[in-house]
């Protein structure tokens, strides 16, 4: 939420955001450790499966949805719900899995149909002219990776990272969460621990690119495990 | 068209209360935070704080924190920005601000606040 | 806070001329900069953000480069109704800061 995000004194001077370790499968982020970053898991097994508390679709895996898990339920509670195929009932857009969107309640193919007045303005402004705007998109519902068919660039908003362009990921920057680079070999990255550890704060990172892990930098002056960098480095 | 109108302009002495308001039209209220902006006379811009009206949360900058409230009511898709108590230093024009990115790119046409005894 | 310093406080130069105005943040931003222009009497306009990206319908003699901590505003030809107050604004980190201005007028 915003109180905690954007109140908390812990994350008003992280680094730079310049990208970062394997973090949240679901958007491909990684965060600060010390701040819950509830989000959808899909790499669980359905045994050793969990669901993951959230409060918006944002925080849910590229093919989930946040909603109470029964209808009629509580609505203080709600998961990371797996998306709706084709044909299904929806009541927005992000209930639909990618390559869907939600027309008179029921999830249909982007590919269909012509988005025509907001959305079609959000495609157009935010990432068809690479003029990122406020007027005509909205940040739960139009930005959808599943209603536009060019890739956002650096900077341009986002809603997950299948929405941004080849080398960069969505992360979540202030009350947005906008394109940003893959982390290069020797950029500082986020490892985080087990389960749960997933930070929601200001400055998410992007994962390490391809062939790099998100390890302890190797240096003989640092004293404790704890303080240690973690930076990119070949596998 | 995203519009934001904010209330007319305020003459009010120290010590007493004010509550000025920022009416949106052309989108959606509750997709977009809204963030209240300072702007003294002749001085630089200073943000304030924002409101995620979609559920109420806030976030204030310290130098604000505790001497003015954000506010929004969905229901007539309009935030607030109020004081309890105005100095004569909160003399002042405050712009409204709507956005989902990292910038500010819709704004209102702010009120000014005149605070003297 | 992130201290953002504009240099010059004010210009003035003829239409048609090429403008620059610079930006300074007291810490490395990366990216995360934003140019507005305000005219007397109305709300500011975002005109650049990202560093480098035009808002929409913003002009394309309008122009923003730089990384880190300096960072640079073009008018690539200047016109009449370019005259205004210029701010930079950084955000990095919270709270967002805005430049002092620059005050841009007609020789």
């Known amino acids: 939420t915003l109180n905690s995000v954007l109140n908390s004194n812990a994350i008003k001077n992280l680094p730079p955001p310049l990208g970062g370790a394997a973090g949240h499968p679901g958007s491909a982020v990684s965060a600060a450790p010390g701040i819950l970053y509830p989000g959808g898991n899909k790499y669980q097994t359905i045994d050793n499966y969990q669901p993951y508390p959230c409060a918006e679709d944002e925080e849910c895996g590229t093919d989930e949805y946040c909603a109470s898990p029964t209808r009629g339920g509580d609505a203080g509670v709600q998961i990371c719900l797996a998306c709706r195929k084709r044909r299904k009932r929806c009541m927005r857009h992000a209930m639909c899995c990618p390559g869907n969107y939600c027309k008179n309640g029921i999830c249909v193919s982007s590919d269909q149909n012509h988005f025509r007045g907001e959305i079609e303005e959000t495609i157009t402004e935010s990432f068809g002219n690479d003029h990122s705007t406020l007027d005509g998109y909205s940040r739960r519902t139009t930005l959808s990776s599943k209603m536009y068919h060019t890739k956002g660039q650096e900077g341009s908003v986002c809603l997950r990272s299948s929405d941004c362009a080849s080398g960069l990921c969505c992360a979540r920057h202030f009350w947005s969460k906008i394109c940003k680079p893959v982390l290069k070999e020797g950029q500082v990255c986020t490892k985080h621990r087990r389960k749960g550890s997933h930070g929601l704060e200001i400055f998410q990172r992007c994962y390490c690119g391809e062939g790099l892990s998100c390890r302890i930098q190797k240096d003989h002056h640092q004293a404790s495990n704890s303080s240690r960098l973690h930076t990119c480095q070949r596998h | 068209e995203v519009q934001l109108l904010q209330s007319a302009a305020e003459v009010k002495r120290p010590g007493e209360s004010l509550r000025i308001s920022c009416k949106t039209s052309?989108?959606?209220?509750?997709?977009?935070?809204m963030h209240w902006v300072r702007q003294m006379p002749g001085k630089e811009l200073e943000w304030m704080g924002v409101i995620d009206p979609s559920n109420g949360d806030t976030s204030y900058n310290q130098k604000f924190k505790g001497h003015v409230t954000i506010s929004a009511d969905k229901s007539s898709s309009t935030a607030y920005l109020q004081w309890s108590s105005l100095k004569a230093s909160d003399a002042a024009m405050y712009y409204c601000s709507s956005t989902t990115g990292p910038w500010f790119a819709s704004w209102g046409q702010g009120t000014l606040v005149t605070v003297s005894s | 806070d992130i201290q953002m310093t504009q240099s010059p406080s004010s210009l003035s130069a003829s239409v048609g001329d090429r403008v620059t105005i610079t930006c300074r943040a007291s810490?490395?931003?990366?990216?995360?900069l934003n140019w507005y222009q305000q005219k007397p009497g109305k709300a500011p306009k975002l005109l650049i953000y990202?560093?480098?990206r035009l808002h929409s319908g913003v002009p394309s003699r309008f122009s923003g480069s730089g990384s880190g901590t300096d960072f640079t505003f073009t008018i690539s030809s200047l016109q009449p109704e370019d005259i205004a107050t210029y701010f930079c604004?950084?955000?990095?980190?919270?709270?967002?800061?805005f430049g002092q201005g620059t005050k841009l007028e007609i020789k």
């Open positions: 810490q490395d931003i990366s990216n995360y």
């Open positions: 990202y560093k480098s």
């Open positions: 052309g989108y959606t209220f509750t997709e977009y935070t």
């Open positions: 604004q950084q955000v990095h980190t919270l709270p967002p800061t």
